[in-house]
Amino acid sequence: SSPCPQAWGPPGVQYGQPGRSVKLCCPGVTAGDPVSWFRDGEPKLLQGPDSGLGHELVLAQADSTDEGTYICQTLDGALGGTVTLQLGYPPARPVVSCQAADYENFSCTWSPSQISGLPTRYLTSYRKKTVLGADSQRRSPSTGPWPCPQDPLGAARCVVHGAEFWSQYRINVTEVNPLGASTRLLDVSLQSILRPDPPQGLRVESVPGYPRRLRASWTYPASWPCQPHFLLKFRLQYRPAQHPAWSTVEPAGLEEVITDAVAGLPHAVRVSARDFLDAGTWSTWSPEAWGTPSTGTIPKEIPAWGQLHTQPEVEPQVDSPAPPRPSLQPHPRLLDHRDSVEQVAVLA
């Protein structure tokens, strides 16, 4: 059997670090057998069989000019094998970050903090850490590790499904190459990394007869679980065209009636979402939707929601079309505490 341990990587390739001494091993001989070494395609002898180094070739302070293919021959001139030298660096700890768009799953992404120049793979796993006792800061032996399944096609991402919202997890991402391994451990809790996707289906409509009103409505992001144990709260911003500053309100539910719009001007509206108990951070803003308040006077009778909905002054603008998801809408009493006359209409 070969005296050369096979490093992880393609067969026939051996590895070293620039600036360091490198030993190449002749694969087709018995350990200690004296061999001669040549560069492939060059007749010049690099190291003879009388070197005392047996089946190994030593290159002091290797540099890029030493990379390439080497040939070793036994005393009788038989081919002992060919070896390709590739230089690079041991792994450095990767940089890892984790994020969650809902309270049941999270993903972690990583990047090398230094390129090694060598074939590299990543091992990803996680443990669940549990606290012993409500008042205790001691941690029980963690459970796991379990693999953190990586995305196919080599994307630097792995996903933990079915995570527990109140638990802490320790993520292990280990960068491995033929010269070694280096591990980054990252402690994460779903509560701190939760960042919902932005709300979807944002529509901005005029309220006929109310020249200073706009009605905005939206739905939960599709990534939020269909039967949510945790609700989202929302933040809405609006501003007239050409106006630099946003006005901000926190709606009670999935719609908001803006009562101080500037008559006759188009308004940009955007919404953001966050866990209703303030876990994690606000989502990014949704794409902006636009609407212009209606012109004209207040009608004698307040039209019903259906009528309003079918005759908006401005065609509703939908940036991210999404079907309505009534199962995601909390009870109407959670949505609105305003007088129905002031609001003109409530959610169906």
């Epitope: 903090s113 390129i115 630097a156 280096s182």
Partner: antibody
Framework: EVQLLESGGGLVQPGGSLRLSCAAS????????MTWVRQAPGKGLEWVSS????????QYADSVKGRFTISRDNSKNTLYLQMNSLRAEDTAVYYC???????????WGRGTLVTVSS | DIQMTQSPSSLSASVGDRVTITCQAS??????LNWYQQKPGKAPKLLIY???NLQTGVPSRFSGSGSGTDFTFTISSLQPEDIATYYC?????????FGPGTKVDIK
Amino acid sequence: EVQLLESGGGLVQPGGSLRLSCAASGFTFSWYSMTWVRQAPGKGLEWVSSIVPSGGHTQYADSVKGRFTISRDNSKNTLYLQMNSLRAEDTAVYYCAKGPGWGQFAVWGRGTLVTVSS
Amino acid sequence: DIQMTQSPSSLSASVGDRVTITCQASQDINNYLNWYQQKPGKAPKLLIYDASNLQTGVPSRFSGSGSGTDFTFTISSLQPEDIATYYCQQYDNLSPTFGPGTKVDIK
């Protein structure tokens, strides 16, 4: 010889913006994480921001988060720091530093002075 | 963030003296600690990495030790050119932090 050369510093009013550059030479720039570290006059060193070789991960000190943006152009061997909404407390010499890995600063530039004052 | 403390904040010693600086982390940082030297008007220079490894080209009178939360930096025989401020720095997590520095001068 490995070299880092910062530029772009100067006097700016509070609320203003500056973009610092760091030109790298003598090594394979695209292989290394890069960092900005600053030092206020007569004070200690403060890490500002770091970026991985691909640019895919960045990290910022709380004191600059949301105001500063680190970026890199590997084709130009250059690191950048875009500084917006500058405050008097951002006055410092800004150093560019090279890895090996993340958080190790084996090579430093000479620094560029940023003064925020009205 | 991980806080780093250094002591003493300054010291005076004679040429040839053994000088010791300590650095303490607010939590376990394994051996992810570097030591830097900064001379007046100059950029910092890495002396010790991973708590105890001497950076290439740095004189052997400089050494470091420690792991976890407590670390020590030693100059075995102080030389006039060692007048500088010395900083420890952790990189256990993704937000590196420096100690406040120790100013070393000659008596």
